[in-house]
């Protein structure tokens, strides 16, 4: 069966600084040289793009300068980091992988990673 399976962790807890990292791994049915990775957020059945990057196999993953995502790639594995998260950003983050070149094209969509973000408590004023 020539299908592409995408695996990602079920749950991730963001750090107190609003940073969440997870691995998106795909089982490639072909030898792709160009891959596009997109992070989607699903909330109330609405899906929105968080960030996307296209990379050549063996090269680094480059997101746009203003992207909240960074990442590194190693073989069929992509290490994704999302920054600047707040409690209201808690939700399901889906990893979408597309094998762009050479043909044929393949699409793979993960089941999503539930990212929990807890805003840090404000520090109480200290009198010294």
């Amino acid at each position: 069966c020539k299908a592409m399976h995408v695996a990602q962790p079920a749950v991730v807890l963001a750090s107190s600084r609003g940073i969440a990292s997870f691995v998106c791994e795909y089982a490639s049915p072909g030898k792709a040289t160009e891959v596009r990775v997109t992070v989607l957020r699903q909330a109330d059945s609405q899906v929105t793009e968080v960030c996307a990057a296209t990379y050549m196999m063996g090269n680094e993953l480059t997101f746009l300068d203003d992207s909240i995502c960074t990442g590194t790639s190693s073989g069929n594995q992509v290490n994704l980091t999302i920054q600047g998260l707040r409690a209201m950003d808690t939700g399901l983050y889906i990893c979408k992988v597309e094998l762009m070149y050479p043909p044929p094209y393949y699409l793979g969509i993960g089941n999503g990673t539930q990212i929990y973000v807890i805003d840090p408590e404000p520090c109480p004023d200290s009198d010294f």
């Epitope: 299908a3 592409m4 899906v47 929105t48 044929p104 699409l107």
Partner: antibody, heavy 118, light 106 residues
Framework: QVQLVESGGGVVQPGRSLRLSCAAS????????MHWVRQAPGTGLEWVAV????????YYADPVKGRFTISRDNSKNTLYLQMNSLRDDDTAVYYC???????????WGQGTMVTVSS | EIVLTQSPGTLSLSPGERATLSCRAS?????LAWYQQKPGQAPRLLIY???SRATGIPDRFSGSGSGTDFTLTISRLEPEDFAVYYC?????????FGQGTKVEIK
């Protein structure tokens, strides 16, 4: 609102050329793959071509390979289909469609009719 | 190329009845969608990922199946549901559609 509007259809003689356009609005055009799908009179849907994101990667159905060229201008939010060496069996309604975030064709234009006849 | 075969070709039913449409693939399919098309109109996405309803689609429409066998069910036919329905695979190129099932009023 999210919308796709095709134009450029018409009646053309076999062997001649035609260029279809698809104007997109209401979404970030460059973030989506765009397809052309056609439907000959009284028949089903047939996928024609796709162009991805920045426009570098394109795929074509075998019956149109070498004759049709798909392109896009992200600055104008417009998709194109250049059709050369047209044949009788290219007669169809041509639809542009957006490949949604999860891959399915979630937005379609109203279609433009292309008739190839001598 | 993945070939999709829909059955039956035509389904004659009355409003209020249940409609069951089948789509069989020549090889395993990872991503399957269903579309509705009325005369003179563009297709409309109903179901994606085999079983997820698209935005604004009534819950009388449901999709099921995996691998090579898929089903679209309309629990109670409304007058506006009489149309042609197409399945499509979108997991790999070339993108392919079934030949369609026409749901007509009996």
């Amino acid at each position: 609102q999210v919308q796709l509007v095709e134009s450029g259809g018409g009646v053309v003689q076999p062997g001649r050329s035609l260029r279809l356009s698809c104007a997109a609005s209401g979404f970030t055009f460059s973030s989506y793959g765009m397809h052309w799908v056609r439907q000959a009179p009284g028949t089903g849907l047939e996928w024609v071509a796709v162009i991805w994101y920045e426009g570098r990667n394109k795929y074509y159905a075998d019956p149109v390979k070498g004759r049709f060229t798909i392109s896009r201008d992200n600055s104008k939010n417009t998709l194109y289909l250049q059709m050369n060496s047209l044949r009788d069996d290219d007669t169809a309604v041509y639809y542009c469609a957006r490949a949604g975030d999860l891959g399915a064709f979630d937005i379609w234009g109203q279609g433009t009719m292309v008739t190839v006849s001598s | 190329e993945i070939v999709l075969t829909q059955s039956p070709g035509t389904l004659s039913l009355s409003p209020g009845e249940r409609a069951t449409l089948s789509c069989r693939a020549s090889q395993s399919v990872s991503y399957l969608a269903w579309y509705q098309q009325k005369p003179g109109q563009a297709p409309r996405l109903l179901i994606y990922g085999a079983s997820s309803r698209a935005t604004g689609i009534p819950d009388r429409f449901s999709g099921s199946g995996s691998g090579t066998d898929f089903t679209l069910t309309i629990s109670r036919l409304e007058p506006e549901d009489f149309a042609v329905y197409y399945c499509q695979q979108y997991g790999s190129s070339p993108w392919t559609f079934g030949q369609g099932t026409k749901v007509e009023i009996k």
